[in-house]
Interface confidence: low
């Protein structure tokens, strides 16, 4: 039938309000209505090649590319993007069509390009081509700065390929540790691209434009410093430049420095040395190891040796793609109402992450601090003792990471009551989750001690806004209690709270709250 295409390609645009993570999925998120991408047979192509209409996506938007295959029998498939094979799990819809989906979350430039889907059915093979681009090519970009050696000069150039052209500055510090914090008087800033004074303790280059500020630190091994307890580690992606500086100070110039990679001397053209006299006529030598574009075989232990100092090493790891390593298992905490507490996530990531803390659909700024062992930590303390679900979300150019936390605040129950013609209900959000009792107040029991067990139904429900639990108890009306006062009480380890309800009274129900500690 000519009217029923064998293949249908659709684009689904997602509302970006969730932080779920994934790449290729058979069950994409609920979202907008699908947009037909046509999927016309490509003329003059060997084999059956369908081409979907070009897809333009806003930066940070989330989409699903979906193919519906109207072919009998089972199908198998494979996605290919930038020469990498991606997992593909077809499933079948209610009309028994094969459905293959590719979810792209938070679109970035690295995710733009051609997505090829190879489908094999019992009858024939197809190839479907999707071209995905970022909608407005005139995007601001802010790329992390990197270093280059200035031609024929002992100087470093700092480059950030960003639009609009960023202001590039060198941030130099000559003292140790805490005093090298950004706003410290020990910090000197130079708004220029080329740096000749390469002897400082701490050298960073920062680029800033309308999008913000990105910095790169010149990785340094200082032979005069006590080595870290854990070996320093430097991550780079294939194709990025590698720069390591080895620095040593000695009483005179009678010493030399050398670089080795896995016990083999670095080749000429991959290092250069500089030296200068310092205070008390001591001599500073620095030796740079550099590779303009790293490959996998540049991975290994780089050791700087001196004839007058103990050697020190750094582990350089070259990765194909960036990563975020952290445990993503959810964590539950319960604290007292005035207890000081911070959520924290320890992670190892490259390139540096951008992160947010989210609570009740509100995002909070995220700070990260580097630890000595190569890990970083992000803490969130601004929870204001509000119970519920807290989400840490981190991403870099290549990876995304989400971790959930639940915060429970230990407190005595607070009871709210409501009643209808047929039942009375009480609600409480205390923690730990309270237990319930219902009591009847009568002539026989003026203190409401007569317990009601019949017709009581307890449940806990998630109050979605905060992700906190609310416990409720419902009493179904019976002839035995009509017209009586009843009392519902919620109790936990921190106390008890009660509400008294007059059943079957016309008009608004009078509620009398009792607080019993």
């Amino acid at each position: 039938n000519q009217d029923l295409p064998v293949i249908k390609c659709v684009l689904i645009n997602h509302k970006n309000n969730d932080s779920s993570v994934g790449k290729s999925s058979s069950y994409p998120m609920v979202s907008e209505s699908p947009e037909d991408l046509g999927c016309a047979l490509r003329p003059q192509s060997s084999g059956t090649v369908y081409e979907a209409a070009a897809v333009e996506v806003d930066v940070s938007a989330s989409i699903t590319l979906q193919v519906l295959v109207d072919a009998p029998g089972n199908i198998s498939c494979l996605w290919v993007f930038k020469h990498s094979s991606l997992n593909c799990q077809p499933h079948f819809d209610l009309q028994n069509r094969g459905v293959v989906s590719m979810v792209i979350l938070k679109m970035t430039e690295t995710q733009a390009g051609e997505y090829l889907l190879f489908i094999q059915s019992e009858a024939t093979n197809y190839t479907i081509l999707f071209t995905v681009s970022i909608r407005n090519t005139l995007l601001y970009t802010l790329r992390r700065p990197y270093f280059r050696k200035m031609e024929n000069q002992d100087a470093l150039v700092c480059i950030s390929e960003s639009v609009p052209e960023p202001i590039v500055e060198w941030v130099l510090c000559d003292s140790q540790g805490e005093s090298c914090k950004e706003e410290s008087p020990a910090v000197v800033k130079k708004e220029e691209k080329v740096l000749h004074e390469l002897f400082g303790t701490d050298i960073r280059c920062c680029a800033r434009n309308e999008l913000g500020r990105e910095c790169t630190r010149l990785f340094t091994i200082d032979l005069n410093q006590t080595p870290q307890t854990t070996l320093p580690q430097l991550f780079l992606k294939v194709g990025e430049p590698l720069w390591i500086r080895c620095k040593a100070v000695h009483v005179n110039h009678g010493f030399g420095l050398t670089w080795e990679l896995e016990n083999k001397a670095l080749e000429e053209g991959n290092y250069f040395e500089m030296s200068t006299y310092s205070t008390n006529r001591t001599m500073i030598r620095i030796l740079f190891a550099f590779v303009s574009s790293v490959a996998r075989n540049d991975t290994g232990y780089y050791t700087c040796s001196s004839s007058k100092h103990p050697s020190q090493s750094a582990l350089v790891t070259i990765v194909e793609k960036g990563f975020i390593n952290a445990t993503n298992s959810s964590e539950d905490y319960e604290i007292d109402q005035y207890e000081e507490f911070c959520f924290s996530v320890r992670f190892k990531a490259y390139p540096q992450i951008r992160c947010t803390w989210t609570f009740s659909r509100k995002s909070f700024p995220c700070e990260q601090k580097g630890l000595d062992n190569g890990y970083s930590i992000s803490k969130f303390c601004n929870h204001k003792h509000q119970p519920g679900e807290y989400i840490f979300h981190a991403e870099n150019d290549d990876a995304q990471f989400t971790k959930m936390f639940t915060l429970n605040i230990r407190r005595k129950p607070q009871v709210l009551a409501e009643a209808s013609a047929s039942q009375a209900s009480c609600f409480s959000d205390g923690y730990p989750l309270p237990s319930w009792t219902w009591k009847k107040c009568s002539d026989k029991s003026p203190n409401c001690t007569e317990e009601i067990t019949e017709g009581v139904w307890n449940r806990k429900a998630n109050r979605k806004v905060f992700g906190q639990w609310v416990s409720s108890s419902t009493l179904n009306m019976s002839e035995a209690i009509k017209g009586f006062l009843v009392k519902c009480c919620a109790y936990n380890s921190l106390g008890t709270s009660c509400e008294t309800i007059l059943l079957n009274s016309p008009g608004p129900f009078p509620f009398i709250q009792d607080n019993i500690s």
Epitope: E109, S133, I134, N136, T137, L138, L139, Y140, T141, I159, S160, E161, S162, V163, P164, E165, N209, E210
Partner: antibody, heavy 119, light 112 residues
């Protein structure tokens, strides 16, 4: 210093194509957009499109869509603008200009290339 | 497309006297970042255009400070405090908020 040097004048017949080059120097080629603007004799300026040398993505004015192709060669820091199916009303001076960011003000311009379309 | 309308079409000036050119856009050029995406260019006879003012009021480096730009939203003005003989040429405003970027029709400044 920043320079944009364009290729020389061209005379073309209607229906033909023309490819104008613009060689950039004196700055990081991939850090700036390069726009193409034309000016018919005695007329005002008309924006044709833009290329991002970092990645090669392009945006064209609707009226040139399908006829214009902008490309770049990062090894030579050169951008190219090819206009096909030429008509007499395409006779104009074609300028390349360096754009600063999204708002794209043009701080440096090439010297211009006169393209004459005549049978 | 955003339509840019310039006035006057022609402006005869006396050297040493001030001059003013108006530019109006069919949509506001004020971006949420606070910038007005409106630039002014001068094209001297036989030359390529050159940037004078960007973001409505920022003077491009190297441009004499007798040139100034003002305005916001849809109405913009270029002023020359004291016209000099070298200021003759055609002045264009251009919007960079949306693609396609569009230019005003130009104002020809000539010495009386």
């Amino acid at each position: 210093q920043v320079q944009l040097v364009q290729s020389g004048a061209e005379v073309k017949k209607p229906g033909a194509s023309v490819k104008v080059s613009c060689k950039a120097s004196g700055y990081t080629f991939t850090s700036y957009y390069l726009h193409w603007v034309r000016q018919a004799p005695g007329q005002g300026l008309e924006w044709i499109g833009v290329i991002n040398p970092s990645g090669g993505s392009t945006t064209y004015a609707q009226r040139f869509q399908g006829r214009v192709t902008m490309t770049r060669d990062t090894s030579t820091s050169t951008v190219y603008m090819e206009l096909s199916s030429l008509r007499s009303e395409d006779t104009a001076v074609y300028y390349c200009a360096r754009g600063i960011g999204y708002g794209g003000y043009f701080d440096y311009w090439g010297q211009g290339t006169l393209v004459t379309v005549s049978s | 497309d955003i339509v840019m309308t310039q006035s006057p079409l022609s402006l005869p000036v006396t050297p040493g006297e001030p001059a003013s050119i108006s530019c109006r856009s069919s949509q506001s050029l004020l971006h949420s970042n606070g910038y007005n995406y409106l630039d002014w260019y001068l094209q001297k006879p036989g030359q390529s255009p050159q940037l004078l003012i960007y973001a409505a009021s920022s003077l491009q480096s190297g441009v004499p400070d007798r040139f100034s730009g003002s305005g916001s939203g849809t109405d913009f003005t270029l002023k020359i405090s004291r016209v000099e003989a070298e200021d003759v040429g055609v002045y264009y405003c251009m919007q960079g908020l949306r693609t396609p970027h569009t230019f005003g029709g130009g104002t020809k400044v000539e010495i009386k």
